[in-house]
Interface confidence: low
């Protein structure tokens, strides 16, 4: 689905647009990007309020609101493989347009540690509550969605567009309509600030086509950091109204002539600008000529000024703007140096954390430390990484290779391990035989025994029922007939399931001794898996029961 711009708020040097439509975070970012912006940042309480205002504007226009919990993507994301950092306000997330880790955050709830997949942040609006300024939208973290599945409950997204500066809205001195078209393709008739390079169409008159006049203006940079429309005098003036309509469109004072004409004027200490509408202070610093955080310092007698930069910044060639000093040029850090506005910070590569001797030093993170291990069973710390391993009878599983899954040796890729019945257990397996056969000393083959109508041998003895440490849900053993003894027909789907009675003798040969579980498990009837081939009892290759064991040292775990 597409996305419609429904609302726009311009303030300072940025405009925020709110869009409705079920898109993934990537699609939303692409949408913002096409018009020269990014998914919005929320780097301060003030910015959170601007974003909330544009959402309030959007929601006011939504005809039918079905969701009572609405989510809107913002530009806060964490890449796959980058772990949560609870010590930071942004918890290891970063803004899509780049920029430093900001101090403001407003998380909805404590974040779950997960490094497996990319995670994205949306603003969570509880529409069941009145949308009050004091109740800023919470940050909700989750999957980023995909084109087919845009993300649960995502209603839309917020874009941010940054500009060199803004023009004041055009003031009309009589009836008329202004339509602004912004560089990010939004049209609006009411903006509290109008971004640089926007066009303004002014249609004067009260709707009577014969009287309508049209004007076209462009918000231009008239001088460094001074933006205006290049219009002179109030627009749509009418002798019928004089100063009575919108103060004649004047910024401060409006003076009427006897013929219905009027002029704009300014209060003491202010001067009229070239547009003949706006007033500016006579103090040279009041027009804020200094940029980039520079402070304007008045010269003697209040005639001229100089710009002064804060620590970590220096004046550029214009002597008006402050530029950041790049402290990283001096390589002050052991691993990564991030230049920040007015300073720098040292960062460590993934798998390392700040620490060790010296400023900006890094030390290996022991992911396998007690209470921290991401692995279900074995964990080996390496320099800057780790890898997981599993005990015998288990293999690595899970998207990130941190879980262990029981190997069903009875259906293993190496073919059947037992000559007759195979019982899979957690981390191991046992062989058994059909009635009339007994398990050979090798624990795999079956030999003809005394005639008996007893059950197949196989259920583990009490001491063999222990489960591997780290295993999760115990599974019932499954009995799989593999090769039937020579001369006996192979099991068919009609074969009645052998019953296990408590008084029948049971033989089993555990291939691997396991620690007892402490409490005996309930023995479950084995299920019969039908074999594909029937041949006489055979010794496994090498005549060694080691074929039944399985070990996996694992692969690298993910950070």
């Amino acid at each position: 689905t597409g996305a419609d711009t429904e609302a726009v708020v311009c303030v300072g040097t940025a405009c925020y647009t709110a869009h409705s439509g079920k898109l993934s975070a990537a699609e939303a970012q692409n949408h913002c990007n096409q018009n020269g912006g990014n998914l919005a940042t929320v780097k301060s309480k003030e910015e959170a309020q601007h974003v909330q205002r544009v959402l309030a504007q959007l929601l006011r226009r939504e005809a039918a609101l079905t969701a009572r919990m609405s989510k809107f993507w913002i530009g806060l994301q964490r890449e796959k493989g980058k772990c949560l950092d609870p010590s930071l306000p942004l918890k290891g997330f970063s803004w899509v347009g780049g920029g430093e880790d900001t101090p403001y955050s407003n998380w909805h709830k404590e974040l779950r540690n997960s490094c497996i997949s990319k995670r994205c942040v949306s603003l969570l609006l509880d529409l069941s509550q009145p949308l009050l300024p004091s109740r800023l939208p919470k940050w909700s973290e989750g999957p980023c969605g995909s084109p087919g599945s845009p993300g649960s409950n995502i209603e839309g997204f917020v874009c941010k567009f940054s500009f060199k500066g803004m023009c004041r809205p055009l003031a009309l001195g009589g009836p008329g309509q202004v339509t602004y078209t912004t560089p990010f393709q939004t049209t609006s008739s009411s903006l509290e600030a109008v971004p640089f390079a926007s066009a303004a169409n002014v249609a004067c008159g009260e709707g009577d086509k014969d009287e309508t006049q049209s004007h076209y203006f462009l918000c231009k940079e008239k001088a460094p950091d001074v933006f205006d429309w290049g219009s002179s005098g109030p627009l749509c003036v009418s002798p019928k109204y004089g100063c009575n309509f919108n103060n004649g469109g004047c910024h401060q004072d409006c003076f009427e002539g006897g013929d219905g004409s009027f002029l704009c004027g300014c209060r003491p200490g202010f001067r009229l600008l070239d547009d003949l509408v706006t007033c500016a202070s006579r103090n040279p610093c009041s027009s804020s000529p200094c940029r980039g955080g520079a402070t304007c310092v008045l010269g003697p007698h209040g005639k001229n000024y100089t710009c002064r930069c804060p620590q970590g910044y220096q004046l550029d060639s214009s002597q008006l703007d402050c530029v950041d000093v790049d402290e990283c040029q001096d390589s002050p850090c052991a691993q990564e140096c991030v230049n920040t506005p007015g300073g720098f910070r040292c960062e460590c590569w993934v798998g390392y954390e700040p620490g060790g001797p010296g400023e900006g030093a890094c030390q290996d993170v022991d992911e396998c430390a007690l209470g921290r291990s991401p692995c279900a069973q074995g964990c080996t710390n390496t320099d800057g990484s780790f890898h997981c391993s599993c005990e015998e009878g288990y293999v690595l599983a899970g998207e990130d290779g941190t879980q262990c899954q029981d190997v069903d040796e009875c259906v293993g890729p190496g073919g059947p391990l037992c000559d007759s019945l195979c019982f899979n257990t957690q981390g191991s397996f046992h062989c058994g035989c059909l009635p009339g056969w007994v398990l050979a000393p090798n624990g795999v083959s079956c030999t003809m025994g005394p005639v008996s109508l007893g059950p197949p041998s196989g259920p583990p003895d009490e001491e063999d029922k222990g489960e591997k440490e780290g295993s999760t849900v115990p599974r019932a053993a499954t009995a799989s007939p593999t090769r039937g003894p020579e001369g006996t027909p192979k099991a068919t789907p009609t074969t009645s399931r052998p019953s296990l009675s408590s008084d029948a003798p049971i033989t089993s040969a555990p291939l691997k001794m396991l620690a007892p579980s402490g409490s005996p498990g309930v023995w479950r009837e084995p299920s019969i898996h039908h074999a594909t081939a029937a041949s006489g009892p055979q010794e496994p290759a090498g005549g060694d029961s080691s074929v039944a064991t399985q070990n996996n040292d694992g692969t690298d775990g993910q950070k």
């Epitope: 303030v11 003030e46 309020q49 601007h50 909330q52 205002r53 309030a56 504007q57 929601l59 006011r60 005809a63 609101l65 009572r68 069941s128 509550q129 009145p130 949308l131 009050l132 300024p133 004091s134 509290e192």
Partner: antibody, heavy 120, light 111 residues
Framework: QVQLVQSGAEVKKPGASVKVSCKAS????????MHWVRQAPGQGLEWMGE????????YYNQKFKGRVTMTRDKSISTAYMELNSLTSDDSAVYYC?????????????WGAGTTVTVSS | DIVMTQSPDSLAVSLGERATINCKAS??????????LNWYQQKPGQPPKLLIY???NLESGVPDRFSGSGSGTDFTLTISSLQAEDVAVYYC?????????FGGGTKVEIK
């Protein structure tokens, strides 16, 4: 035109409950919050709470929490305000008023008011 | 709760003269550039009527002799030329915080 029509005057004994209704017409009932405001004789205005007729969510002034219940019947575009454990201090004119859904929730349309008298 | 204090309690103004009512909030009712402050007019035996919302926006159908100004904690309602039908009690209201609170009212009479 947009109208909020309230139920008639009520006389109640202390300890009793009162339920006032407010029928909306001329606009989409579920697109605006409905508020209740009361005014004691010769006194100012006091906001009691609001209900979202769309989903029946309520938001009460803490002063009345536990005593007030706001409900609505979408099928007949009517909002209700019930106040329990009445005392003589609850004698007032009770107004319903609608507000926009988001942002500055000013009350642009008011009912004519329902006079509730609590007397033994 | 935000306390709204109106002054004066009552005001007597001659017909055609200017009437000014003040409203002070115990804390700022501004939010991201908007003032969440509204003015209502109440005539005897009638419900309140919205005059101005967001400090300075005139509600449609309200005569333009009414105007509002102010921001933060200090707000003013001005009637530029008092008419006989303007005799009423005027209330300010903040909608920036819960609970939404009203001022005590200012009674405007003709001198």
């Amino acid at each position: 035109q947009v109208q909020l029509v309230q139920s008639g005057a009520e006389v109640k004994k202390p300890g009793a409950s009162v339920k006032v209704s407010c029928k909306a017409s001329g606009y989409t009932f579920t697109s605006y919050w409905m508020h209740w405001v009361r005014q004691a004789p010769g006194q100012g205005l006091e906001w009691m709470g609001e209900i979202d007729p769309s989903a029946s969510y309520t938001y009460y002034n803490q002063k009345f929490k536990g005593r007030v219940t706001m409900t609505r019947d979408k099928s007949i575009s009517t909002a209700y305000m019930e106040l329990n454990s009445l005392t003589s201090d609850d004698s007032a004119v009770y107004y319903c008023a609608r507000s926009v859904y988001y942002g500055n929730k000013y009350f642009d349309v008011w009912g004519a008011g329902t006079t509730v008298t609590v007397s033994s | 709760d935000i306390v709204m204090t109106q002054s004066p309690d009552s005001l007597a103004v001659s017909l055609g003269e200017r009437a000014t009512i003040n409203c002070k909030a115990s804390q700022s009712v501004d939010y991201a550039g908007d003032s969440y402050l509204n003015w209502y007019q109440q005539k005897p035996g009638q419900p309140p009527k919205l005059l101005i919302y967001a400090a300075s926006n005139l509600e449609s159908g309200v005569p333009d002799r009414f105007s509002g100004s102010g921001s933060g904690t200090d707000f003013t309602l001005t009637i530029s030329s008092l008419q006989a039908e303007d005799v009423a009690v005027y209330y300010c209201q903040q909608t920036n915080e819960d609970p939404r609170t009203f001022g005590g009212g200012t009674k405007v009479e003709i001198k």
